[in-house]
Amino acid sequence: MMTGTIETTGNISAEKGGSIILQCHLSSTTAQVTQVNWEQQDQLLAICNADLGWHISPSFKDRVAPGPGLGLTLQSLTVNDTGEYFCIYHTYPDGTYTGRIFLEVLESSVAEHGARFQIP
């Protein structure tokens, strides 16, 4: 039975040209995290594997940095980066947990963080 929950940074906004940290945290389970995949609308951004470490997709190498922790840092943001991001936690023996973050990249300097929320 899957008992864990994923807490994410929720709905966030950031300024064009700036950077943002995407963070997820798995709690309420003793399952072993074997891998975390970061995805954006059916595109692989990065993978962090417990044994192999980080792999950043070649097309994002210049703008994506691993960490902090299992999170992901997006740099040199553009308006095209607006959209849904997913952290997919592969765990043993529970299986897969998915967290969702919505990022809005703003032209103006007004960028606020949204509330944190949980996905079971």
Epitope: Q32, T34, Q35, E39, D42, Q43, L44, I47, N49, A50, D51, L52, H55, S57, S59, H90, Y92, P93
Partner: antibody, heavy 118, light 107 residues
């Protein structure tokens, strides 16, 4: 340099058994999931089995489930495929492949031919 | 099981041609799609992983695109060493499945 070297293939009668080995070198074997893929003469590629790095969990194609067993010995950097109750349709070249991040197969061995015939 | 359908099954082309091979999954597989090249008597070689990422050491004339159910492998300018059979493969779920292959022959 990453190398995968299969061995153990040969001619076997229907109902017989074989154990294939895949000796790995040039990388930290224990950190990678590994797979077996086969190719019947003149045919396409067919996945046979995989074993994960972190948990040792194994997965099988329906066509071999209950007859084949995948295993690994990380101390020997070797992947195995125990094949029992072999059938004529198991005749193929068997490849081992490294599977980083459980998403793609980036290195393959040269293959070993298994022929099941009476 | 997820079925992978490749088309065409074979094609004839000339050196310098632009070649496109398509692969369709029977259900959405997100970006979990890889492309391999195989020459007679040789092991498959990874070209493209995760739908669009070029494997290290593979020439840039190879590119991949698509997500969900429809994917494409493109060779921008066919070279003599590119005549081979190409396979797509999904890694979204087990059983892992391959397309039937596309044989690229010399016209």
């Amino acid at each position: 340099e990453v190398q995968l070297l299969e061995s153990g293939g040969g001619l076997v009668q229907p109902g017989g058994s074989l154990r294939l080995s895949c000796a790995a070198s040039g990388f930290t074997f224990s950190s990678y999931s590994m797979s077996w893929v086969r190719q019947a003469p003149g045919k396409g590629l067919e996945w046979v089995s995989s074993i994960s790095s972190n948990t040792g969990t194994s997965y099988y194609a329906d066509s071999v489930k209950g007859r084949f067993t995948i295993s690994r010995d990380n101390s020997k950097n070797t992947l195995y495929l125990q094949m029992n109750s072999l059938r004529a349709e198991d005749t193929a070249v068997y490849y081992c492949a490294r599977e980083p991040y459980d998403v793609w197969m980036d290195y393959w061995g040269q293959g070993t031919l298994v022929t099941v015939s009476s | 099981d997820i079925q992978m359908t490749q088309s065409p099954s074979s094609l004839s082309a000339s050196v310098g041609d632009r070649v496109t091979i398509t692969c369709r999954a029977s259900q959405s597989i997100s970006y979990y799609l890889n492309w391999y090249q195989q020459k007679p008597g040789k092991a498959p070689k990874l070209l493209i992983y995760a739908a669009s990422s070029l494997q290290s050491g593979v020439p840039s004339r190879f590119s991949g695109s698509g997500s969900g159910t429809d994917f494409t492998l493109t060779i921008s300018s066919l070279q003599p060493e590119d005549f081979a059979t190409y396979y797509c493969q999904q890694s979204y779920s087990t059983p892992l499945t391959f397309g039937g292959g596309t044989k690229v022959e010399i016209k």
